[in-house]
């Protein structure tokens, strides 16, 4: 007796986060001998699409022509062979950008710091929102959540940096969201580029979770130091 | 129990379209994709497409794209399927058909079907 | 298109009789094979699903069998109310096919 099919892989076109009315294909990959591929999406009750695979059979196209809010979510795919149904594939989570207002993002005191320095990213929106995401361009690992501790919403959210190096460097844009759908987040903020001039001592960030040795400087988590922010936000890496 | 109360028999004009309508009862319709199946006088069946009441999402036969467009109204439970172009070719009988399960695309369920005819 | 080819296309037999109904696909359809029951002026009743699964209140008189491409509907004691047309459907793939039909007449 075989084991279990080896489950299939899935991913979004042209990313999984996509912006109200844009176009966005989920693609489902599993194996030569799929004979169908199901798209599911939690918390929806019926399989949310079902397709025949294309040719050479080893993968299906799932198609959005207009991204909107109940696009969003979290989904897996299976394909079916002639043995029986795979096993899930990893999830996906499909964000929509666009769902609210723009915030603001500013750097305090200024957004260019001298290396060694401190610099704190102010994320600003006009509704009370209870998550904020601070993303760097170019960063492997983009997302840094503040989330508020018992859904009090909040105006802003504070990113700290110290001691800022060369790493912190680069443009930043920043997302405001609400807890009940972290899938729909607001429109960007406009782009913030923070500029760090050189000092004597160049001090490189402690990261606080290992990362790959291959990874070059952008490809290091955003690490922000220092204490929880005082707005009752609690830091939730992603 | 499960039952799939279909709209009347139509009586169409060459050129125009008409809108079916398939109203759901006995069950969670969210639940179920619904099939579409057109059956011409005393002929064989043919299977249109279908829909996921849930979200609206559709497949549809390569020869029926042109053809058919379904949709659902999930507040009243009812399926609908709008045929344009009207031909002759187009007198059928059509059914609404309801999805067996998750993990099965039987179809278990058939509405009463409703009878198109296309005529000048 | 997978397509589905029944035989007979017609046949008469007489009631206690047991008949035979069978379907082959133009390929292997992994037993995703559907039977339906058609009266004049009615709409299909589902007999049996994934090739030999009975659907629940049928009677235990019809069973499905077969697997690959060849399929069959057997009637193990002909009774009146069986008359009608028996159609197979594939679903194996999209989209999916139906048989042309066999009817049942009574002998």
């Known amino acids: 007796q075989a084991g279990p099919l080896p489950k299939p892989t899935l991913w979004a076109e042209p990313g999984s986060v996509i912006s109200w009315g844009n176009s966005v294909t989920i693609w489902c990959q599993g194996t030569l001998e799929a004979r169908e591929y199901r798209l599911d999406k939690e918390e929806s009750p019926a399989p949310w699409d079902r397709q025949n695979p294309l040719e050479p059979k080893n993968k299906a196209r799932f198609s959005i022509p207009s991204m909107t809010e109940d696009y969003a979510g979290r989904y897996r795919c299976y394909y079916r062979s002639p043995v029986g149904w795979s096993q899930p594939s990893d999830p996906l989570e499909l964000v929509m950008t666009g769902a609210y207002s723009k915030p603001t993002l500013s750097a305090l005191p200024s957004p260019l710091v001298t290396s060694g320095k401190s610099v704190t990213l102010l994320c600003q929106s006009r509704s009370p929102m209870d998550t904020f995401l601070l993303i760097k361009e170019r960063a492997a690992h983009p997302l840094l959540h503040l989330r508020s501790e018992h859904g009090a919403q909040q105006h802003q959210a504070e990113f700290p940096m110290s001691p800022v190096t060369s790493v912190h460097g680069g443009t930043y844009r920043c997302f405001s969201s609400h807890g009940f759908s972290h899938y729909l987040l607001s429109h960007p903020s406009d782009p913030l580029e923070l500029i760090v001039s050189g000092s004597l001592e160049d001090p490189r960030p402690s990261p606080t979770r290992s990362v790959s040795t291959a990874a070059g400087p952008e490809d290091q988590p955003l690490m922000p130091t220092g204490s929880v922010p005082h707005s009752g936000l609690r830091r939730h890496w992603e | 129990q499960v039952q799939l109360e279909q709209s009347g028999a139509e009586l169409v004009k060459p050129g125009a379209s008409v809108k079916l309508s398939c109203k759901a009862s006995?069950?969670?319709?969210?639940?179920?994709?619904m099939h579409w199946v057109k059956q011409r006088h005393g002929q064989g069946l043919e299977w249109i497409g279908e829909?996921?009441?849930?979200?609206?999402?559709?497949n549809y036969n390569e020869k029926f794209k042109t053809k058919a467009t379904l949709t659902v109204d999930k507040s009243s439970s009812t399926a609908y399927m709008q045929l344009s172009s009207l031909t002759s070719e187009d007198s059928a009988v059509y059914y609404c058909?309801?999805?067996?399960?998750?993990?099965?695309?039987?179809?278990?369920?058939w509405g009463q079907g409703t009878s198109v005819t296309v005529s000048s | 298109d997978i397509v589905l080819t029944q035989s007979p296309s017609s046949m008469y037999a007489s009631l206690g009789e047991r008949v035979t109904i069978t379907c082959k696909a133009s390929?292997?359809?992994?037993?995703?094979l559907s039977w339906f029951q058609q009266k004049p002026g009615k709409s299909p009743k589902t007999l049996i699903y994934?090739?030999?699964r009975l659907v629940d209140g049928v009677p235990s008189r019809f069973s499905g069998s077969g697997s690959g491409q060849d399929y069959s509907l057997t009637i193990s004691s002909l009774e009146y109310e069986d008359m009608g047309i028996y159609y197979c459907?594939?679903?194996?793939?999209?989209?999916?096919?139906f048989g042309a039909g066999t009817k049942l007449e009574l002998k």
């Open positions: 058909a309801k999805n067996y399960r998750y993990d099965d695309w039987a179809m278990d369920y």
């Open positions: 459907l594939q679903y194996d793939e999209i989209p999916p096919t």
């Open positions: 829909i996921n009441p849930s979200n609206g999402r559709t």
């Open positions: 390929e292997d359809i992994n037993s995703y």
């Open positions: 006995g069950y969670t319709f969210t639940n179920y994709w």
């Open positions: 994934r090739a030999n």
